[in-house]
Interface confidence: low
């Protein structure tokens, strides 16, 4: 249909403007649109000036590209004549309404295909797909290689020239190591290469008292160790020991008026017994602060354990479970209150219901047919447990709950009896005092560890097992073991540790297999009031890491051997420890100090909740972290 239209237009042009002269209006009737008419008519007048000598000035045939008026006029509507495209770069030219479209050859761009594409800078094909050097050329590009490499047949990748194979005796009895573009004569650690004899000579490091605390000698080397669990670390000289110093002081101020609910990893923090007149009803008022999402705030029961009430937190909301001779109920309601703010909570037994209020606003009203606890002999006897419940209760709950709750309460008033007697108990016991200010996170005080049982086997993967670790850390000391996998034979097949860096005010992260550092991330400023995000991915073939500064896949000659050691351990059973090491020999790892600071850990996509640990040191805080100590003008 388009070609028929073009032929019609061409015929009209012939009749109207070549066989006869046409004015602009007549030309408009030929083209039937303004852009083409406005483009055509001035050029038509130029053709007339050139060929219609009788009408205009004499034609200068010598300067005209066309032999006659017909050719000159017929060429006007063709935007591709004369060719507007760059001859080197164009593939075809398409005529349009008072416009043209140049289709470019590969390697060219621009309206007229006048610009060479720099394939070497193409973001979608980095470095033009060349493994080493990319050289851009007009309309094309080619790859080349650095010294010591040769180009492969695919013309993109470079292969290293193996000098060690070309000259087998180049290093004598030492090992010739081919490196990209060069070679090296290598000796095992603890030996040095002798150029004259072309051999490796042993270095005897441990013949003198090299180490301050403990020296372990082995063929080709030695290692000094310090007792990290007593707060020592190896000094920069790798021989003497120094105290692990605080790099980020924390505000560890506590108040005895604030009761810490997570004093015990397993067990009740406070137990009270009330004997009140039979007209009394259950009542509890307190201010409550936590970042924890699940756990027991308080549990109350009758003396004979026939009736009980549980006030807990689940999903950050208040949950009430109750059971007595009349009813068995579970209710959750109100807003999420694990926001780290002080929330006023009251639970009051009314005549026909139990009212739960947050900030004096009713959030739940639980109907009950009769009294919650039945009086006996004119007395209402009630036992109240803070932050836990007796062991036997666990199986009786309507819905199971993890009782551990990292939180604080203050301004409590139980059974309308005020705080009498309780403050006196708490005042004497430092462990029951809560920190004045806390932030979200988990806190490791540098004195203990948490243990988890995690199955790293991935049956759906060819790798067989994998360890994907994400750490969000805010250390307070620059040295300590953050995460360790420990085998049954007291070896540590994998550990992630922090050490103070040789460069001032920065830290290195060590990845180790047994007592060998397989990778060191150097000079990161981790001791700041901002959290740092670290990621590690390990399987039997690869080790990848991501830090605030870089993402990389680690590969070095010894790595596969170390990963094989790790692979063997992972096929047996390993225990996962956070914050330090259990009782393993000093020489089991490069670092043995406890980690001190805030840390949140995600392993294989699961955020580890310290409340779910197999065991945890009581001083580790599962869901609260002390604030950074701010210097005031007076201090």
């Amino acid at each position: 249909a388009n070609s028929l239209l073009e032929e019609t237009k061409q015929g009209n042009l012939e009749r109207e403007c070549i066989e006869e002269l046409c004015n602009k209006e007549e030309a408009r009737e030929v083209f039937e649109n303004d852009p083409e008419t406005d483009y055509f008519y001035p050029k038509y007048l130029v053709c007339l000036r050139s060929f219609q000598t009788g009408l205009f000035t004499a034609a200068r045939q010598s300067t005209n590209a066309y032999p006659d008026l017909r050719s000159c006029v017929n060429a006007i509507p063709d935007q591709c004549s004369p060719l507007p495209c760059n001859e080197d770069g164009y593939m075809s030219c398409k005529d349009g309404k008072a416009s043209f479209t140049c289709t470019c050859k590969p390697g060219w761009q621009g309206e007229k295909c006048e610009f060479d594409i720099n394939e070497c800078k193409d973001p979608s094909n980095i470095n033009g797909g060349c493994s080493q050097i990319c050289d851009n050329t007009p309309g094309s590009y080619h790859c080349s290689c650095k010294n010591g490499f040769v180009m492969l047949s695919n013309k993109k990748d470079c292969k290293d020239v193996d000098e060690c194979s070309l000259k087998p005796s180049i290093c004598g009895t030492a090992v010739c190591k081919n490196i990209p573009g060069d070679f090296e004569c290598e000796c095992p650690e603890g030996y040095r290469y002798n150029l004259k004899s072309k051999s490796c000579e042993d270095i005897d490091e441990c013949s003198e008292n090299m180490c301050a605390q403990l020296c372990v000698n082995y063929p080709g080397g030695y290692t000094c160790y310090c007792d990290g669990k007593k707060g020592f670390k190896l000094a920069q000289d790798q021989k003497s020991c120094e105290v692990v110093s605080v790099c980020l002081p924390l505000n560890l101020d506590t108040k005895y008026e604030l009761l810490y609910l997570a004093e015990q990893f397993a067990g009740v923090v406070l137990y009270l017994k009330f004997r009140l007149p039979e007209i009394s009803r259950f009542s509890a008022e307190f201010d409550f602060r936590t970042y924890d999402s699940e756990g027991v705030i308080l549990y109350a029961e009758s003396i004979d354990h026939s009736a009980w009430l549980l006030i807990a937190l689940r999903g950050g909301k208040i949950e009430v479970q109750l059971k007595n001779e009349h009813t068995s109920k579970i209710t959750t309601g109100g807003d999420v209150i694990n926001n780290g703010l002080w929330n006023m909570v009251s639970v009051e037994e009314l005549e026909h219901s139990i009212s739960i209020k947050i900030a004096k606003e009713a959030v739940m009203d639980i109907n009950k047919p009769g009294p919650l606890f039945k009086p006996e002999n004119g007395l209402l006897e009630t036992k109240v447990y803070f932050a836990g419940f007796p062991r036997k209760v666990e199986s009786e709950l309507i819905k199971p709950i993890n009782p551990r709750l990292d939180g604080c309460i203050r301004s409590w008033n139980l059974m309308k009896q005020g705080a009498s007697g309780i403050k006196e108990i708490i005042q004497e016991k430092q462990n029951k005092h809560c920190l004045v200010t806390v932030e979200k996170g988990s806190y490791y005080p540098g004195s203990g560890i948490a243990q988890f049982h995690i199955d790293y086997n991935n049956v759906s993967s060819a790798e067989g097992w994998h360890v994907n670790v994400t750490l969000n850390i805010r250390p307070s000391t620059g040295t300590g073991v953050m995460l360790a996998l420990v085998s049954g034979n007291n070896t540590v097949p994998f550990a992630v540790s922090l050490v103070d860096s040789t460069s001032e005010k920065s830290q290195d992260i060590l990845l180790s297999v047994e007592n060998t550092v397989i990778y060191r991330i150097q000079a990161l400023s981790l001791c700041s009031d901002q959290q740092s995000h670290l990621e590690f991915r390990v399987n039997r073939n690869n080790l990848e890491l991501s830090t605030p500064l870089k993402i990389e896949t680690i590969s070095h000659e010894d790595l596969q051997r170390q990963l094989a050691v790790l692979d063997k351990a992972m096929k047996a059973k390993v225990a996962t420890y956070l914050g330090g090491l259990p009782d393993v020999p000093f020489s089991a790892t490069p670092v043995n100090a406890f980690y001190n600071g805030c840390m949140e850990v995600n392993i294989n996509g699961v955020q580890l909740d310290l409340d779910e640990a197999i065991s945890k040191h009581n001083d580790i805080r599962a869901h609260s972290c002390p604030s950074v100590w701010k210097k005031t003008k007076n201090s």
Partner: antibody, heavy 122, light 107 residues
């Protein structure tokens, strides 16, 4: 008695879309998480998707991730399931189900609608 | 995901007799297990939750037991209205999963 009434099912060609609705009544709709569960002809029950009481959190079975979208309008007491790029294997009766617990966590389903049949076929 | 396996697939019982249905989880679901009953052409109906708690209006002849990975639904004396398909459902972790069902038929 809680009432859940599904609608929007029907015959659709492979690659097509449907939007299911579930009208809820006789309970405090905005306090409960809701789910969609489906049952292919002659087969068992398969959980498809869930949405929190406020609608801020959504969960999907791997088989429908990226293809189905669950949503709710608490002002209209209505639950929705937008199904795109439908395949023959999505042919099933789709039930909407009420979460037993109120508040922000998820449990079993204490009430089910009568279901609406979705047939994906040429 | 947690795989729920029900056995037997079909159970033929005389009216008035006891029926015992089994449900096994591929990993622990604690007590977070529900049982649903579905009659032909009808929507499912909740029977038990928390492994052993009867839902509102469910007769005492239905009882549940078990925790962790092994669960049992028992119907002490089968009535004509009990012949249906029974499904177990775990609600311990995403995605929620159902067993393949046990069809209880008249012998």
């Amino acid at each position: 008695e809680v009432q859940l009434l599904e609608s929007g099912g029907g015959l659709v060609q492979p690659g097509g879309s449907l939007r299911l609705s579930c009208a809820a009544s006789r309970f405090s709709f905005s306090s409960y998480a809701m789910s969609w569960v489906r049952q292919a002809p002659g087969k068992g029950l398969e959980w498809v998707s869930a949405i929190s009481d406020s609608g801020s959190n959504t969960y999907y079975a791997d088989s429908v991730k990226g293809l189905f979208t669950i949503s709710r309008d608490n002002s209209k007491n209505t639950l929705y399931l937008q199904m795109n790029s439908l395949r023959a294997e999505d042919t099933a009766v789709y039930y909407c189900a009420k979460n037993y617990e109120s508040g922000g966590y998820y449990t079993f389903f204490d009430y089910w609608g009568q279901g609406t049949l979705v047939t994906v076929s040429t | 995901e947690i795989v729920m396996t029900q056995s037997p697939a079909t159970l033929s019982v005389f009216p008035g007799e006891r029926a015992t249905l089994s449900c096994r989880a591929s990993q622990s679901v604690r007590s977070n297990l529900a049982w649903h009953q579905q009659k032909l052409g009808q929507a499912p109906r909740l029977l038990l939750y928390g492994a052993s708690t009867r839902a509102t209006g469910i007769p005492a002849r239905f009882s549940g037991s078990g925790s962790g990975t092994e669960f049992t639904l028992a119907i002490s004396s089968l009535q004509s209205e009990d012949f249906a398909v029974y499904y177990c459902q775990q609600y311990n972790s995403w995605p929620f999963t159902f067993g393949g069902g046990t069809k209880v038929g008249i012998k």
